[in-house]
Structure formats: C-alpha cells, structure tokens
Interface confidence: low
C-alpha cells in the first residue's frame, strides 16, 4: 500500500522519533535529512542518523531495496552518522530507516524518513478563479493544471511548514487538473502558493513546482499580521530550503515577529481550549454510541519531531501546532460526497507567521473511491483501521507492532462528513540546549 500524500508531502516534515520506546534493549535512533526531506533533482542531501554515544556503527535501510542501503562508522562523538547523497535522483527517493550497533547489539529501527524528489515531471500551472485578488468572506478556487494526466495534486503555501491539501483522484482516472476551493476566504488565506503533481505509482516523486501564485485577500481588519507582500522569493521555494525559516529575524522586524508569534499562540490556545470543550460535550452526549458508530477519533499517540540540525542551519521540520480557525471547520462544505478521496492535513508551527485556514479539495469530473485513497502512513500518524494497518505493515520491510499505535484516550465527534483527527506531538528535542518549544497539536481532516 502506498503511503499517503499527507505523509510524504509534509514538505520537509521528515519523520522524527516518537517519544516512546519500543520493546528491546536499545532506544531507536533519530533519522532526519538536511537541508530537508523534499529535494529537487540533482541537488545534494545528507541523511543523518543519531543514536547514542555507545554506537559503534550505523546502518541505513531503504524500503523495498533488497539489501541494506548504506553503512557508516559514527562521527565523533559517535552519537551520529552521516549518509550522503551527492545528487538526488529518482533512485534515492523512498522510505528509509536507520539502526545503530552498540556493544549490546542492534538498536530498534528509527521511525521512517520519507525522502521525496521534486522535478520528476514538468511543472503544473497554478491559477486562481475568479481572481487572485479576493475579498474576505468571498470564495476562491485555486486550480492546478498539468500538461499530462496525473492522479495526485498537492497545494502548498510558502512559509507554511506543511502541505495544505492534497488530492488523489480515483485510481486510473487521471486528471489534467485539480480544484482547491477556499470558502469563505479569510485573511489567513493570503499568501504565496505553489502546486505539484504526481503519479500514484510513486508518491516519492513530484513534479517541478508550479510558478508561485500570490493570493491577495482584501477587506479584512481583524488580521493581526502584516498583509501579504507582493514580492515573491523564488529562492526560498518549497524544495531544498525550509518552507518556514527558523533562523534569525532581522532586527527591525523582531518585535513585530514576536507580537505575531504571541498572538498566534494565544489564539491557538484559546481555540484549542474551545475545541476541547466542545469535544468533551460531544463525547458526553454521544457516550451511548458504540465505537463502530463513531465517525472520528481523537487520539494522542506519542510523537516527536526530528532534532534541529546541529549546525543550527535552517530546517524544514517544526512542531506542528493547532491551526484550526473556528469558522473554517468545513462550514463551507455542502453535499460533499462521502466517497471523495480527499485528505487534508493542516499543521502550523508556533514559529509560523502564516497560519493556514482549513480548506478542502475536490477533483473536477471524478468521484474518487475512498478505498483508492491510500491511508496515512506513520508520517501523518497511524490512523488506519486494523485491516489497513495490516496492509501497510505488510508493505513495509521492517514491520513494527501496531500495538504502540493504539489510542489511549479516545473521544469522538461528528463534523458533517469529515473526520477530525487530532494528534498531540512533542517539540523537537534541542541539540543545542535551547529551550524546547511548547507542546503542540495538529489536526488532520479526512473526508469519509
């Protein structure tokens, strides 16, 4: 079973280790990629595996390769190893895990790292209908069009730490375009967007990014952040540079940066509190329902993002945070067909200056079957039912017990035809002694 686009298209969201330990004598190592896990063709990438100071050797496995992919001796002080890919090609795209050996034996496998290559196909065209200039409260549809038929389309927003939406059409029913409607538009929708296209046979291979499209939202006074600028920096595109700069902020903008940051955090906390309150009420009201009747689950599997690069360089990963605008809980969705094979993942870092409202996508002239939409891979949390999870594990070379993925406290809520899945994660452990970010939450919305 192919990992979902939500999984591998968290541009740069290479999977970090979960905080829990698996059974076994040695803790699993951390696996990450620099400058990120989404790399354009021909560019170099370094995969890092970090274990313990007792590690004597590191080993990297690439899924579906018949043999171990690489082995390296540790770099001093022996707690990590470097695996270099001098020039990214299709052959390197895929799913990796690493192990380390200490005097007591081999470690557990790391959580998987999904290395995605862009530039495999010609770039699609991204346009806005009716116009990229939209008034707050109105509707706009972003249209991603490819020259040749593709079955997967992805919409990303620059400087957001995640892909906003992806759309996978019915198997075999390839499209030349995909629509990403946004309604009602708010100020947070403003910004620069790009889209990618891909074939379902390899979700690790993406097209070149489309040219950027800037969405200008006017007529909003409640927006706490500066209006989106018209200048587009193509250098900081969604491929090899972080989508969300975590480095230094110019001094002139530092105060404004923190104001925005604090504002976003406060709003996020308030919204999260409200959300949890509503969910608690829902849970109390629906206590009599059986698990099989519940439409959505809220679970808190342990999770953690990968560590920041030791050199303090820019990175793609960030702690996903709640990014749910109250008015955007699919309120605009009317008559959504329950079989639409669409999955959405909204994540936003506490550092992100550009929180993204939840939207949804549909394929023009298609009714994707739900069974054709791949279930989320571990990258987006294990939200598989028993059958799907087994199928996913069967696909993997290194099967891991699904027991650790069982939800602990499960609450249920019905949101129209959507399922809201909320997963708590922990911030990336700091290698530099910096104080960790606040624990954060992200939500995944999936049409059922």
């Amino acid at each position: 079973m192919i990992p979902t686009f939500t999984a591998l298209l968290c541009l740069g969201l290479s999977l970090g280790p979960r905080t829990h330990m698996q059974a076994g004598p040695l803790p699993k190592p951390t696996l990450w990629a620099e400058p990120g896990s989404v790399i354009s063709w021909g560019n170099s990438v370094t995969i890092w595996c970090q274990g313990t100071l007792e590690a004597r050797e590191y080993r990297l496995d690439k899924e579906e390769s018949p043999a171990p992919w690489d082995r390296q001796n540790p770099l001093e002080p022996k707690n990590k190893a470097r695996f270099s890919i001098p020039s990214m090609t299709e052959d390197y795209a895929g799913r990796y895990r690493c192990y380390y050996r200490s005097p007591v034996g081999w470690s557990q496998p790391s959580d998987p790292l999904e290395l995605v290559m862009t530039g495999a196909y010609s770039k699609p065209t991204l346009s806005a209908l009716p116009s990229p200039l939209v008034t707050s409260g109105k509707s706009v549809t972003l249209l991603c069009q490819s020259r040749s038929p593709m079955d997967t389309f992805l919409l990303i927003k620059e400087r957001a730490a995640h892909p906003l939406l992806h759309l996978r059409s019915e198997h075999g029913a390839q499209q030349h375009q995909a629509e990403f409607p946004m309604s009602p538009v708010t100020s947070v929708h403003g910004g620069t967007y790009r889209c990618f296209s891909s074939h379902g046979f390899s979700h690790y291979l993406l097209s070149h990014p489309s040219d950027p499209l800037e969405l200008i939202v006017s007529g909003s006074l409640e927006d706490p952040r500066p209006s989106p600028t018209r200048s587009v920096s193509t250098a900081a595109g969604p491929e090899d540079q972080p989508l969300m700069p975590t480095g230094s902020v110019p001094h002139s903008g530092l105060r404004r940066h923190w104001e925005v940051l604090i504002g976003v955090l406060v709003v996020s906390i308030l919204l999260l509190s409200l959300l949890l309150f509503l969910l608690l009420q829902h849970w109390r009201q629906g206590k009599h329902r059986t698990l099989a009747q519940r439409q959505a689950d809220f679970q808190r599997p342990p999770g953690a993002a990968e560590p920041e690069p030791k050199d303090g360089g820019l990175q793609r990963r960030s702690s996903p945070a709640a990014d749910v605008q109250g008015e955007n809980f699919c309120a605009a969705v009317k008559n959504t067909q329950p079989e639409d094979g669409v999955e959405m993942d909204t994540r936003q870092s506490p550092h992100d200056e550009d929180p993204q409202a939840v939207t949804y996508a549909k394929v023009k002239h298609s009714r994707p079957r739900r069974e054709m939409a791949s279930p989320p891979s571990p990258l987006s949390g294990e939200f598989l039912d028993t059958k799907d999870r087994q199928a996913e594990e069967d696909r993997q070379m290194d099967t891991e017990a699904a027991a650790s993925e069982a939800p602990q406290d499960v609450t249920y809520a019905q949101l129209h035809s959507f399922t809201l899945r909320q997963k708590a994660t922990e911030p990336p452990p700091s290698q530099e002694g910096a104080s960790p970010a606040e624990p954060s939450v992200y939500a995944t919305l999936a049409i059922h």
């Epitope: 004597r56 050797e57 080993r59 390769s65 018949p66 043999a67 171990p68 992919w69 690489d70 082995r71 001796n73 695996f83 270099s84 890919i85 001098p86 090609t89 052959d91 192990y99 050996r101 034996g105 081999w106």
Partner: antibody, heavy 111, light 111 residues
Framework: SLEESGGRLVTPGTPLTLTCTVS????????MTWVRQAPGKGLEYIGF?????IAGYATWAKGRFTISKTSTTVDLKVTSPTTEDTATYFC?????????WGQGTLVTVSS | ELDLTQTPASVSAAVGGTVTISCQSS????????LSWFQQKPGQPPKLLIF???KLASGVPSRFSGSGSGTQFTLTISDVQCDDAASYYC???????????FGGGTEVVVK
C-alpha cells in the same frame, strides 16, 4: 548480467585490477559485492560498494583490496598480490542477498 | 570478527530424503536474520537459495527452506534430488562489511 575480466597470471606484489562489467543493472540501485574462491576451497567475502560509491571491506581484506565503480563497471584492485590471493574472483549483485553472480575470473599469483 | 561455523562439513543423503545443514554465528546477526544460503556446483558461481534466513529466492524450489534467528540457522532440503548434489554455504552479516563472512561450506552427496 555480470562479467568479470582482468584475471591473469601475475607476480607477487604486482598490482592487479579486476573489472566487473554490468549490463541491464543500474548501479545506482544496487550495491555490488566481490567474493573469491581459492582452488578447492570455500567462498571468501571481500567487500562491497554501495549505490553512493562507498566501499566496505571484510576485516582481512582491508588495505589489500580497493573497490570502486563507474556507471557500468565495478573494479576490484588487488594492491599487492601474494600467492594466497590465487583464486577465482566473482562479482555479485547486492550486499548479503547476492542474487546475481558473474562466472568469475581466475587470478594466479606466482613467482 | 564474525565467525560462521557450518556443520556438517559433508553429508550424504538418499534421493527423496531430507538434509539439514546448520550454520552457527559467533554473534547475533544484524536484525537477527541477515543470513543467506547459497548452492554451488563445480565450475559454476554460487546460486542464491535463501535470504534473510527464511525467504526463498526467486526460482528456487520450495524443497529448500531456511529457518533460524540470531545465532543459529538451518537450511533444510526435503525430498532430495540428484540435482541437489553440491556445496552449500551460508553468508552472515554482523557489521559494516568487515564482519560479513561465509561459512566453511557443506558438501552434499546424493546417493
């Protein structure tokens, strides 16, 4: 397919390079391994080169052999052969799961 | 350094019978299962039979089976055929290529 070449009679100390020419195999996808077998003896694992071009060697082989590759060949250099290096040398695809082998090339080291 | 001890060194079996070859590692292998089995006939390169301790290689009859984990591994040939007369080798991997090694081999004679 895999085809080894370069095997010949050499005197001790004379460097020798064996070449494994691959066809229909993408060396960007597969690690390659060298194995040898002295006459009437068992198999000996020499080392490998992975898809990024990093080589690894058996403990006994380190310093005595160098493995390198191009897009279509994998070379094994015997840096300073001794009579103990007389053997048939095989190249094989993959690392441990050696699923495709060449026919081998015979190296004889004699003074 | 990894040491793989193969037993017996030689075994004879009747057609239709069963042969069991053992391979014992001095240390637990990588992922407890990084062991392959090969068949080699005189004048030919080895042929992969089993990889990752128990997985049957493509095109290999199901009469061949592998089992074991950690340090103890077994190759079983059931319903032995005349064509099975050959030498059999295990190949284990512990760490970094330096300790990838073959067992000493077992000669199977079919009566």
């Amino acid at each position: 397919s895999l085809e080894e070449s370069g095997g010949r009679l050499v005197t001790p100390g004379t460097p020798l390079t064996l070449t494994c020419t691959v066809s229909g195999i993408d060396l960007n996808k597969y690690a390659m391994t060298w194995v040898r077998q002295a006459p009437g003896k068992g198999l000996e694992y020499i080392g490998f080169i992975n898809i990024v071009g990093i080589a690894g060697y058996a403990t006994w082989a380190k310093g005595r052999f160098t493995i390198s590759k191009t897009s279509t060949t994998v070379d094994l250099k015997v840096t300073s052969p001794t009579t103990e290096d007389t053997a048939t040398y095989f190249c094989a695809r993959n690392w441990i799961r050696l699923d495709l082998w060449g026919q081998g090339t015979l190296v004889t080291v004699s003074s | 350094e990894l040491d793989l001890t193969q037993t017996p060194a030689s075994v004879s079996a009747a057609v239709g019978g069963t042969v069991t070859i053992s391979c014992q590692s001095s240390e637990s292998l990588y992922k407890k299962n990084y062991l392959s089995w090969f068949q080699q006939k005189p004048g030919q390169p080895p042929k992969l039979l089993i990889f990752e301790a128990s997985k049957l290689a493509s095109g290999v009859p199901s009469r061949f089976s592998g089992s074991g984990s950690g340090t103890q591994f077994t190759l079983t040939i059931s319903d032995v055929q005349c064509d099975d007369a050959a030498s059999y080798y295990c190949l284990g991997d512990y760490t970094n290529g330096r300790d990838t090694t073959f067992g000493g081999g077992t000669e199977v004679v079919v009566k």
